[in-house]
């Protein structure tokens, strides 16, 4: 069964800046990755970025930089300032659509005890 992993890290240099990394463990052709916060995309979450392997990347504030790390993993940096900036207990979710298996998603947040720079 395919799985999705999610890591959330607070940047040591900018305490309200986050890096989210997500990866897909499974076969099939990854067609789309959707990153959201505040819950899964289908359950009230707000989309931060959509990454397509051929048609490019779309991102919305406070997302600063979304990119493919490998063919099956992505990373997203969030801006740390402004009214829409995330807080330490924000939930981030990644949904990988793989053809023809379907969609697989997982969520993660910064552990409450984490020091800046530690990965979840």
């Amino acid at each position: 069964t395919p799985e999705v992993w999610v890591q959330v890290r607070m940047e040591a240099t900018e305490l309200s800046s986050f890096t989210i990394r997500c990866g897909f463990l499974g076969s099939g052709s990854i067609s789309l990755v959707t990153v959201s916060w505040g819950g899964p995309n289908g359950a009230g979450g707000t989309t931060l970025a959509v990454l397509h392997p051929e048609r490019g990347i779309r991102q919305w504030a406070p997302a600063r930089q979304a990119r493919w790390e490998t063919q099956s993993s992505i990373s997203l940096i969030l801006e740390g300032s402004g009214a829409s900036s995330p807080c330490a207990n924000t939930t981030f979710c990644c949904k990988f659509a793989s053809f023809p298996e379907g969609s697989w998603e997982a969520c993660g947040s910064l552990p409450p005890s984490s020091d800046p720079g530690l990965s979840a």
Epitope: S29, S31, N41, G42, A43, H52, F99, P100, E101, S103
Partner: antibody, heavy 120, light 107 residues
Framework: EVQLVESGGGLVKPGGSLRLSCAAS????????MSWVRQAPGKGLELVSA????????YYPDTVKGRFTISRDNAKNSLYLQMNSLRAEDTAVYYC?????????????WGQGTLVTVSS | DIQMTQSPSSLSASVGDRVTITCKAS??????VAWYQQKPGKAPKLLIY???NRFTGVPSRFSGSGSGTDFTLTISSLQPEDFATYFC?????????FGQGTKLEIK
């Protein structure tokens, strides 16, 4: 304008074979996953086969596994369905459809359908 | 396989009526639900994707809602051209499965 045109349907005896074709135009065929969906007379819709954009991944439900083979030729903008060991219950209109990644794999374009009748 | 149970299977209504069709999935399908309209002898046409997004050219009287396992297609004010059969579909896990259809007829 996106167009999908099926051909190859007809009357065939039980145990016989048919090869359906779907000619695509108006879009970059190699960028889209494709499927065959059938509809028996007066019945609902059933996915019978799916293939990824590069042709590397395929899917078949148990009802047709081992009898049907989906393939595509991206150079010819064509999708195929080879149907062997046909049964009376395979009688249906067969539609070629295109999956849109950005729409959660919803099928945003369909052909007009080709009728396959399996009868002695 | 994920089952999509659609209700009602048939429905009689008049022009101008507000109509609701429901679809229940046997397990959570996130927001990967689409709705299609099919007229006799024609191919299905995509109406709604991702639960609530109208496809290009679909009139605003069509709307979708729901989450998890329960989804709804609403036609706010029926027009003569809306009498057709409607199918829900989940595209969350293969095989993509469809509801059995709702035939909307003129009262």
């Amino acid at each position: 304008e996106v167009q999908l045109v099926e051909s190859g349907g007809g009357l065939v005896k039980p145990g016989g074979s048919l090869r359906l074709s779907c000619a695509a135009s108006g879009f970059t065929f190699s960028s889209y996953h494709m499927s065959w969906v059938r509809q028996a007379p007066g019945k609902g819709l059933e996915l019978v086969s799916a293939i990824s954009r590069d042709g590397d991944s395929t899917y078949y439900p148990d009802t047709v596994k081992g009898r049907f083979t989906i393939s595509r030729d991206n150079a010819k903008n064509s999708l195929y369905l080879q149907m062997n060991s046909l049964r009376a219950e395979d009688t249906a209109v067969y539609y070629c459809s295109r999956h849109e990644d950005y729409f959660g794999f919803a099928m945003d374009s369909w052909g007009q359908g080709t009728l396959v009748t399996v009868s002695s | 396989d994920i089952q999509m149970t659609q209700s009602p299977s048939s429905l009689s209504a008049s022009v101008g009526d507000r109509v609701t069709i429901t679809c229940k999935a046997s397990q959570s399908v996130s927001n990967d639900v689409a709705w299609y309209q099919q007229k006799p002898g024609k191919a299905p046409k995509l109406l709604i994707y991702y639960v609530s997004n109208r496809f290009t050219g679909v009139p605003s009287r069509f709307s979708g809602s729901g989450s998890g396992t329960d989804f709804t297609l609403t036609i706010s004010s029926l027009q003569p051209e809306d009498f057709a059969t409607y199918f829900c579909q989940q595209a969350y896990r293969s095989p993509w499965t469809f509801g059995q259809g709702t035939k909307l007829e003129i009262k």
